[in-house]
């Protein structure tokens, strides 16, 4: 049996709106269906219906389709918002342009190319003929209006209301004539809706025949409305998926403007002195990469040949040398005058300050009502009710839907870090948004933190000095390579995820990094047959001033006998003075003879007022903070070992209570190291490790 | 998808010459960067040539430079190497294959997308 095309391409969308008529004569028919696609058989094929259907209204809370003869451009008809509603207009009818020889043309232009009018298809004066329209069902030969009921050459015509001209045709442009772009169509929002092929694009809110990732509610601002010829992931001009199941995606054919033709209204916000969100619209003079090291002209193929010219990216303004992000990277980039770096990231250039104006939070920010809808890495937040499923995954109560309005920033999760909101991005599905404490707010999100009230067990290079060689096998600690060197330490806390410092990442190029699992010389000597070596598919970066980071990897590692995760504590909870605890690291040890084994350092818990007395009062820790103190004289965390573990244990369960950062001294005596604060962060943790997929082993 | 097949190959004298093709379906060449790779036996796969997408920006591998030429056709949707004086060592099975622009590097022939069958070329001496 061959299966029945789907038509619902053919119509236009128009979401939470319905059509009123005023003129009590037009007629409408309804009846009740369970999808829009079964209105869309009906009204193409006109089944069943007492009138030529041109649009109808599916009533999504009713399950019910409204079948209309006529459409939103009619007279004696007009739109009116309702929720549950969504209006389908066949294109056809709204169409001012033809496709191929305009066959499905079904518009009103009624004058030929020269300029007289048409004679009415139902009358045989001045012309007889027999294109009667009982005759070409279908073909809606209605009124007088140009057709083309048998895909002639030459396009849509009419029998002229001239005696002396029997027919002529209608000067109908092309669609892809009336269509188009600026620069690489990441902002076109035209009506193009087939292929350079001539192939029926596939709507973005249909799975069928192509299953994709780009779906219209979680990219609210890249235009999928129906199946419109787009460009979301920087292309070089507009594509679609194909309703034909053995072409994927194709380009469409639409013409580049006449200058100034077009508004260009979601081009991104041009900077030159910051980066506003991945730094698309950054257009300053950087011209050196994090290091210092000078970039390659982008005209230029040396050192590095190269695709990415300005002739391949017109408006992406690479001019000279400076740093760009024409291909929607982390982050503005360019290819280095190093023959041996390829490409480098600008990580030196600033953000632009995302504070909006007085807006700030209270507390942790649960009953923040502001409007803003950006994350603090500028990504416009996706609407709360297209991801209600995702939210109720990870709490365990019924969030109070009035406060979730729209996309704007909330914290319905009761999060420590303040508002939040899920974004249109599949990599990043929600993040924090950049709006800070109010000033003089001193709510404490965690209380009591010197006292034990919670328990924490559930059931330069920076380098350990003066360490004892570890013996044991610490199979949660992890070595971060940055260019095949040592650069940081780190804790595996989950198959997938490593805990580490921001501080370890001078490059934002995942490909210069590499995880080293289960070694014991930094070197890797000597431990081939336990080694793990894992790439990094992403860096998650912790709440405002966190200095943490959680490391994503690109496949699990395998948990064996080398290779093991270490746990997390409870949130908010503290550990007892003189709990003992230590610090691992590999590196420069203060030994001349340094063998490059991984060391440890024993400390112990010290609260965290002693702490800054040690510190001679210059120093005041906060809740986000934990401070451990040496039993041996200079034998503590130094530059190096950042992104480290503090492992205590407590009730026979190890834990990371720390994480080693910089700025606060190297191994000084009497001088107390201080560590970021895992617990004020492990819910943080836990909601990345529930929320962003992993790859499966 | 992109379906590139190549053609043109065959047995030849040293010193002689042969225009390899390389057509593409399903998609317009011209938004695509073409290289040509090519692999002889129990040796590994090596760059030959590559044309940019947008610009007539062409380069070579020092093996071939000023004896091999690639160029393309964009009415037509296809990508030609001609190879002149050609040698013994030229013995290969030639590949053309298209990419995006990317940050890779176009020698990289893990950064192309889109692969042909190849076409074997023997130079007899």
């Known amino acids: 049996q061959r299966k029945r095309r789907n038509t619902i391409h053919e119509f236009k969308k128009s979401a939470k709106t319905t059509l009123i008529k005023i003129d009590p004569a037009l007629k409408i028919k309804t009846k009740k269906v369970n999808t829009a696609d079964q209105c869309a058989n009906r009204c193409t094929r006109n089944k069943g219906l007492p009138f030529t259907c041109k649009a109808f209204v599916f009533d999504k809370a009713r399950k019910q389709c409204l079948w209309f003869p006529f459409n939103s451009m009619s007279s004696g008809v007009k739109k009116e918002f309702g929720h549950e509603f969504d209006l389908y207009e066949n294109k056809d009818y709204i169409r001012n342009c033809i496709i191929g020889k305009g066959r499905s043309y079904k518009g009103t232009v009624s004058i030929t190319k020269s300029g007289i009018k048409c004679q009415p298809w139902s009358s045989m004066i001045p012309h007889e003929h027999s294109f009667l329209p009982s005759s070409y069902r279908g073909k809606d030969l209605q009124e007088n209006y140009c057709r083309n009921p048998r895909g002639e050459e030459g396009g849509p015509w009419c029998f002229t209301s001239n005696p002396e001209v029997r027919y002529e045709v209608c000067d109908i442009p092309q669609c892809s004539e009336v269509e188009c772009m600026t620069c690489n169509g990441e902002s076109y929002r035209g009506l193009m809706d087939h292929t350079e092929s001539g192939k029926i694009c596939q709507r973005w809110d249909h799975q069928t025949p192509h299953r994709h990732k780009f779906l219209p509610e979680r990219y609210p601002d890249k235009g999928f409305d129906d199946n419109y010829c787009r460009n979301p992931d920087g292309q070089p001009r507009p594509w679609c998926y194909t309703l034909d199941p053995h072409t994927r995606w194709e380009y469409c054919a639409i013409k580049t403007c006449a200058d100034n033709t077009m508004n260009d209204t979601d081009v991104p916000l041009e900077t030159t002195e910051c980066i506003q969100g991945q730094g698309e619209g950054y257009r300053g003079t950087v011209n050196t990469i994090w290091n210092g090291i000078p970039c390659q002209r982008w005209d230029s193929q040396y050192p590095h040949e190269h695709d990415m010219t300005p002739e391949n990216f017109k408006c992406k303004d690479l001019r000279e040398n400076y740093c760009r992000n024409p291909d929607g990277s982390e982050s503005p980039w360019c290819f280095t005058t190093d023959p041996n770096i390829r490409v480098g990231y600008c990580s030196q250039i600033p953000n632009c300050d995302m504070s909006h104006g007085q807006d700030c939070y209270r507390g942790n920010g649960k009953n923040y009502m502001g409007n803003l809808s950006q994350t603090r890495s500028g990504l416009t937040c996706s609407m709360w009710d297209k991801n209600m499923e995702d939210l109720h995954r990870h709490i365990f109560w019924e969030p109070d839907a009035s406060k979730l309005n729209e996309n704007y920033c909330r914290n319905p999760d009761d999060d420590a870090h303040g508002p939040w909101c899920y974004t249109g991005n599949p990599l990043i599905p929600w993040d924090y948004c950049p709006i800070s404490r109010c000033e003089g707010d001193t709510t404490p999100t965690i209380v009591n933190l010197d006292h034990p009230v919670i328990s924490c067990a559930k059931t330069k290079q920076l380098r350990v000095v003066n360490g004892i060689p570890t013996r044991t096998n610490i199979g949660w600690m992890v070595s971060l390579r940055y260019r095949n060197k040592h650069i940081c330490g780190g804790s595996l806390i989950k198959e997938s995820w490593v805990l580490t410092a921001r501080q370890c990442f001078p490059s934002r190029d995942l490909k210069d990094y590499e995880a080293w699992l289960g070694i014991h010389d930094v070197h890797g000597r000597g431990d081939e047959k336990c080694k793990q070596v894992l790439n990094v598919s992403q860096l998650v970066y912790g709440p405002e001033g966190s200095d943490l980071v959680l490391m994503k990897l690109a496949r699990p590692a395998v948990l064996d006998d080398f290779v093991s995760t270490i746990d997390l504590p409870n949130y908010g909870c503290t550990i007892p003075e003189k709990t003992s605890c230590s610090v691992y690291g590999w590196g420069y040890t203060g030994l001349i003879n340094y063998d490059g084994l991984l060391r440890v350092a024993h400390l112990y818990i010290m609260g965290n007022e002693k702490c800054s007395q040690h510190h001679r009062g210059k120093v005041t820790l906060n809740e986000s903070e934990i401070c451990a103190g040496a039993e041996k004289i200079g034998s503590g965390p130094c530059e190096g070992d950042y992104g480290g573990p503090l492992v205590c244990e407590q009730h026979k369960m190890r834990m990371v209570l720390g994480v080693i950062v910089p700025g606060r001294g190297c191994a000084i005596p009497n001088r107390p190291g201080i560590f970021v604060r895992v617990a004020y962060y492990a819910k943080w943790i836990h909601k990345i490790i529930l929320t962003y997929k992993v790859p499966q082993s | 998808e992109v379906q590139l097949v190549e053609s043109g190959g065959g047995l030849v004298q040293a010193g002689g010459s042969l225009r390899l093709s390389c057509a593409a379906s399903g998609r317009t060449l011209s938004d695509y960067t073409m290289g040509w790779f090519r692999q002889a036996p129990g040796k590994e796969r090596e760059f030959v040539a590559r044309i940019n997408t947008g610009g007539p920006i062409t380069s070579y591998s020092d093996s071939v430079k000023g004896r091999f030429t690639i160029s393309r056709d964009n009415a037509k949707n296809t990508v030609y190497l001609q190879m002149n004086s050609l040698k013994p060592e030229d013995t290969a099975v030639y590949n053309c294959?298209?990419?995006?622009?990317?940050?890779?590097?176009?020698?990289?022939?893990?950064?192309?997308?889109?692969r042909g069958q190849g076409t074997q070329v023997t130079v007899s001496s």
């Open positions: 294959a298209a990419r995006l622009p990317t940050k890779m590097s176009p020698r990289d022939y893990s950064s192309y997308a889109y």
